[in-house]
Amino acid sequence: QLTTESMPFNVAEGKEVLLLVHNLPQQLFGYSWYKGERVDGNRQIVGYAIGTQQATPGPANSGRETIYPNASLLIQNVTQNDTGFYTLQVIKSDLVNEEATGQFHVYPELPKPSISSNNSNPVEDKDAVAFTCEPETQDTTYLWWINNQSLPVSPRLQLSNGNRTLTLLSVTRNDTGPYECEIQNPVSANRSDPVTLNVTYGPDTPTISPSDTYYRPGANLSLSCYAASNPPAQYSWLINGTFQQSTQELFIPNITVNNSGSYTCHANNSVTGCNRTTVKTIIVTELSPVVAKPQIKASKTTVTGDKDSVNLTCSTNDTGISIRWFFKNQSLPSSERMKLSQGNTTLSINPVKREDAGTYWCEVFNPISKNQSDPIMLNVNYNALPQENGLSPG
């Protein structure tokens, strides 16, 4: 059976296509090619007589067609208007004709696309942004890339207009991109230059660093304030509610106890119109910023229940400190049988009961520091055992 085949089927605009003919019958008189799905004299492209080896253009001839003795038709410098069906009429010597129809599709060589945006400076959590991939072309697939990745599944990302438009609903600061669009057809592909979003946001709640609260007299106080913001925030400092200066950093040399107080950082974004503040308390004191690790001792570590008593002592060389006791992560005293004395240095349990068995430790602290001892284990039993005195923790 007579057939035609397009080589290639998908043709780039400006290139050439060959309509190949297969299974030509014997005893041929001539050929005639037509534009369309049927023989139509008004749309004849070219005729060819085998006997004279002559061809003649028909009404639909553009000057770009060449017919070959084997009936194949070459069309050069194709345009998108050439897309469609082509019918070959084979005239046999006996005037019993055969026909075959083929087709091809012409696609443009795609240009480098560009991205247009309806809002290049959106406000976080408020604005939506629509990106459109230009130009609009027929028979084209539009693809989008964010950070060189294909689009993630997200309810905030919407494709429309045949995927030519990408809409970001309620932008966030993480939506800066870069964004790229790619256009594809069966013969070419091209990607745009990247586009980034300048998302306006903040300021977030400021952070004052360093985190220290306690300072010794004579030290330098240097505080820095930072709030995530675009454009960058404008900062100002207040001490005890009184404006000090409009800088991101506050520096006070040679502080005294009079510099103790509440330090407020105020961050402002002039574009979003938002303000945020953070307050930090600074205490200037002679107290030791580092408390040494205390030692814990027990009058005995194994006692008889309901009979014996025990004294636990927490010792430290630091001054101006406080002591507190813990048993099984609970603060003591926890019963009337437990007594603290000598400024909480000694914990007495009298009498000792079964539930008092377990791990004890003490913690020494001042307003700017604390430290805790290693734990000590108290064993309680109810049979007469020799008593051990003054054992240090093991």
Epitope: F29, G30, D40, G41, G47, A49, Q54, A55, I91
Partner: antibody
Framework: EVQLLESGGGLVQPGGSLRLSCAAS????????MSWVRQAPGKGLEWVSG????????YYADSVKGRFTISRDNSKNTLYLQMNSLRAEDTAVYYC????????????????????WGQGTLVTVSS | QSVLTQPPSAPGTPGQRVTISCSGS????????VTWYQQLPGTAPKLLIY???HRPSGVPDRFSGSKSGTSASLAISGLRSEDEADYYC???????????FGGGTKLTVL
């Protein structure tokens, strides 16, 4: 079945007019060139006129030029021959015929032929 | 007087080979293809040979055509009684810008 059927013949006085029709069926009429051929009683064939598939070209024998007009209506699959100023020598059986070949070479008329014929219609010009 | 010249008659006997000639000029046969038609008594003409020598479907291969210069010929081999008919040659004439027929040849199978 490919068929051509002429009609419109009859007796007409000299100087009179007649319009012949040829109804085509069984093929795509609009793709083919068509002709009128006549045959006087007991005489040979005489080509009268031809028309291209799209009516773009029309041809006439010298003997009928200026008196006969060939036309076609592709939407009705019909070929016509308008005959005016009829003479006695126009008396004949008039056949319509189809040219089987599309234009294959620059000189389209080179392969002119007629493969399908009607049964003919008799035109008698007499007073 | 026809533009193309054919012998008025051509006799033959069954089984014989008969040739009918057609003579023209440079403006017709010398420049264009020749066609042959058969007209059986009381019927419309039938295409026998086109483009000098090509036979349409249904035409027996006993019929053949040829052309040389300004003349053409139709050969019928293995003549049969049903071949008895009038035979016409035809060609386009560039000078007249018209199609022309020969005067016809009456083939008689004796």
């Amino acid at each position: 079945e490919v068929q051509l059927l002429e009609s419109g013949g009859g007796l007409v006085q000299p100087g009179g007019s007649l319009r012949l029709s040829c109804a085509a069926s069984g093929f795509t009429f609009s793709n083919y060139d068509m002709s009128w051929v006549r045959q006087a009683p007991g005489k040979g064939l005489e080509w009268v006129s031809g028309i291209s598939h799209s009516s773009g070209s029309k041809y006439y024998a010298d003997s009928v030029k200026g008196r006969f007009t060939i036309s076609r209506d592709n939407s009705k699959n019909t070929l016509y021959l308008q005959m005016n100023s009829l003479r006695a020598e126009d008396t004949a059986v008039y056949y319509c015929a189809r040219d089987p070949l599309p234009c294959l070479i620059p000189k389209c008329s080179y392969y002119y032929a007629m493969d399908v014929w009607g049964q003919g219609t008799l035109v008698t010009v007499s007073s | 007087q026809s533009v193309l010249t054919q012998p008025p008659s051509a006799p033959g006997t069954p089984g014989q080979r008969v040739t009918i000639s057609c003579s023209g000029s440079s403006s017709n046969i010398g420049s264009n293809a020749v066609t042959w038609y058969q007209q059986l008594p009381g019927t419309a003409p039938k295409l026998l040979i086109y483009a000098d020598s090509h036979r349409p479907s249904g035409v027996p291969d006993r019929f053949s055509g040829s052309k040389s210069g300004t003349s053409a010929s139709l050969a019928i081999s293995g003549l049969r009684s049903e071949d008895e008919a009038d035979y016409y040659c035809g060609s386009w004439d560039d000078s007249l810008n018209a199609y022309v027929f020969g005067g016809g040849t009456k083939l008689t199978v004796l």
